[in-house]
């Protein structure tokens, strides 16, 4: 669809005569009839297949035509067509004399014709005017013409219909060739697809209007590139939604079980070395001079009774010092200056000469020891405390300080590892010689039944339209991550326009 436009510029009829040569009285009141038709090698009479148009009286004899409305007529003249422009045409322009006001063909005498011109040729659609001038014996007509497309029609033949729009069905304007030109922020064949916020994750995000980024279930962040961990996940992260991958030193389904008590709580004192030995369990290796579960107790260096032969021990800042009884010397009073003649054996010990009387040895009665039978037997020397318990002399008696997991007078009893109910999710606990064992109920596994091995809710492929399925471990249900263009719990519905706000 388009318009053939004809712009009449000047008509010269100096003598004011008709085609017959007869003069007009009082002058030639001139109007024009235009016939546009298909291309003919020789332009002949017949139907004006592309259309006709007539002007009002534009002037008398010779005159210029203004390029706007003139006496109710339009200049340029419009010859609309509702077909593909063929690129060729024939044009007939007749100048007529109007003796009266009735310009209809049947109201005019046949000899009222002033002049008639006929041209034919090819003409491409375009904005540029073609200027032409036709001269006969008595008249001259100057005019220009062109073909342009109607509103919303484009292309070389005005055959491409394109109407700009900005609604749900498209967001575009039209290019000169009739192709769509998407408005900023839109893309796709019909410019219906919004261009999301720059960087918005292709799978995890989508948008319903330009420059936004809406996150699919389980994702968050400005670009929907951060997964949301399993609800209740304490010390863990995720790489896909609803995961809970534990940070170093944490375990359990929700990463809330402390496997690195040493690092998280630093229980060992006085520079001791800490070793993790299970959930919330640890062992401290004390530096010399310290004792206790957490190495919190300072040992006196005299506690080991380093002074011999009845020497008395004195604690000092940098160690200890032995005060030797008469007849003894040395760091630990280990050297004697006595012989049996000096009766060196205490507590009923009997003396035996050695090295021709230069030395001696005491044979002690039961419950006494030492080179001079000066010490009561240390009840701890026989290591009576089992399972690594620490023996402590307490006056006439002794006691054992047990390591974690043991009890009894001699630490001989194993504390049940099951007493702490270590098996998660209703697992059954069995005490073993070196620890424990959990028998897990259906749906759980792992050393402590902490790993959920429930049926994969995604196994039945419940998501439609190539959506990605995720299993929600807390509920044994599935979540469908929909591709662009689909919504619904199973991505079964084509997308509409989602509301922007929950109000």
């Amino acid at each position: 669809s388009g318009v053939f436009q004809l712009q009449l510029q000047e008509f010269i009829n100096e003598r004011g005569v008709l085609a017959s040569g007869r003069p007009c009285e009082p002058g030639c009141r001139t109007f024009f009839r235009v016939c546009l038709k298909h291309f003919q090698a020789v332009v002949s009479p017949g139907p004006c297949t592309f259309g006709t148009v007539s002007t009002p009286v534009l002037g008398t004899n010779s005159f210029a035509v203004r390029d706007d409305s003139s006496g109710g007529g339009r200049n340029p003249l419009q010859l609309p067509f509702n077909f593909t422009w063929p690129g060729t045409f024939s044009l007939i322009i007749e100048a007529w004399h109007a003796p009266g006001d009735d310009l209809r063909p049947e109201a005019l005498p046949p000899d009222a014709l002033i002049s008639k011109i006929a041209i034919q040729g090819s003409l491409a659609v375009g904005q540029n005017w073609l200027l032409d001038e036709q001269t006969s014996t008595l008249t001259r007509l100057r005019y220009s013409y062109r073909v342009i497309c109607s509103d919303n029609y484009y292309g070389d033949n005005c055959s491409r219909l394109c109407k700009k729009r900005n609604d749900h069905f498209g967001h575009y304007v039209c290019q000169p060739d009739g192709n769509l030109s998407c408005l900023p922020g839109w893309t796709g064949e019909y410019c219906q697809q919004p261009i999301c916020l720059s960087g918005c994750h292709e799978q995890n995000g989508y948008c319903s209007k330009p420059a936004e980024c809406l996150c699919r279930p389980g994702w968050q962040g400005r670009l929907c590139n951060e997964c949301i961990p399993h609800n209740g996940c304490r010390h863990g992260t995720c790489s896909t939604p609803w995961q809970c991958t534990c940070d170093e030193g944490w375990g359990g389904l929700f990463c809330d079980q402390d496997l690195n008590y040493c690092t998280h709580h630093s229980p060992c004192k006085n520079g001791a070395t800490c070793s993790n030995s299970g959930q919330r369990s640890y062992t401290c290796t004390c530096r010399p001079g310290y004792t206790g579960v957490d190495c919190e107790l300072e040992l006196s260096e005299c506690d080991s009774n380093p002074c011999r032969n009845g020497g008395s021990c004195k604690d000092q800042e940098d160690g200890y010092h032995c005060l030797c009884p008469p007849g003894y010397y040395g760091l630990h009073c280990e050297h004697s200056t006595l012989s049996c003649a000096d009766s060196p054996c205490f507590n009923g010990g009997s003396c035996r000469e050695r090295n021709q009387g230069a030395n001696y040895a005491c044979e002690c009665p039961p419950n006494f020891t030492g080179s001079n039978c000066e010490k009561k037997v240390d009840r701890c020397t026989s290591n009576p405390c089992a399972n690594g318990g620490q023996c402590l002399n307490r006056g006439p008696s002794r006691m054992c300080r047990c390591r974690p997991g043991f009890t009894g007078t001699y630490c001989e009893l194993h504390v049940s590892d099951c007493a702490r109910n270590p098996c998660a999710h209703g697992g059954t606990c069995h005490d073993l010689e070196n620890g424990l064992m959990c028998t897990c109920p259906a749906g759980f596994s792992g050393r402590r039944c902490e790993v959920r091995t429930s049926i994969d809710a995604c196994a039945s492929s419940p998501c439609f339209n190539r959506a990605t399925c995720y299993t929600d471990l807390s509920t044994d249900t599935f979540v469908c991550n929909c591709p662009y263009g689909f919504v619904g719990s199973r991505c079964e519905f084509p997308v509409g326009l989602p509301p922007s706000f929950p109000w």
């Epitope: 936004e212 980024c213 809406l214 968050q220 400005r222 670009l223 929907c224 949301i228 996940c233």
Partner: nanobody, 123 residues
């Protein structure tokens, strides 16, 4: 059941300060980005500020930038909004919410919502 409960709103003179709190329960607060949204009488909702799950990244609307400060304490499951140099145009109901969708300037779609707390700034 997810709950977001805002508090700390009230009537304050222009130029004054308020601190809003949002107590979260029923979900792992420390795993979610959070934001503050406000709605003035007769107007649509307006995004105010947002903070990522760890608390290290913050965003502000131009209208409050430099005056408001968003923060969070994941050990207390609480979101905060410190509002200084308040203006009469800050008068609105303030909501805390979990952002679900972002536009070029900030969040505009949300998952969980609180019930809101009224802030009125008199001139």
């Amino acid at each position: 059941e997810v709950q977001l409960v805002e508090s700390g709103g009230g009537l304050v003179q222009s130029g004054g300060s308020l601190r809003l709190s949002c107590a979260a329960s029923g979900f792992t607060f420390g795993s979610y980005d959070m934001s503050w949204v406000r709605q003035a009488p007769g107007k649509g909702p307006e995004w105010v500020s947002a903070i990522n799950s760890g608390g290290g990244i913050t965003y502000y609307a131009d209208s409050v930038n430099g005056r408001f400060t968003i923060s969070r304490d994941n050990t207390k499951n609480t979101l905060y909004l410190q509002m200084n140099s308040l203006k009469p145009e800050d008068t609105a109901v303030y909501y805390c919410a979990t952002p679900r969708g972002w536009g070029p300037t900030g969040p505009h779609e949300y998952g969980y919502w609180g019930q809101g707390t009224q802030v009125t700034v008199s001139s």
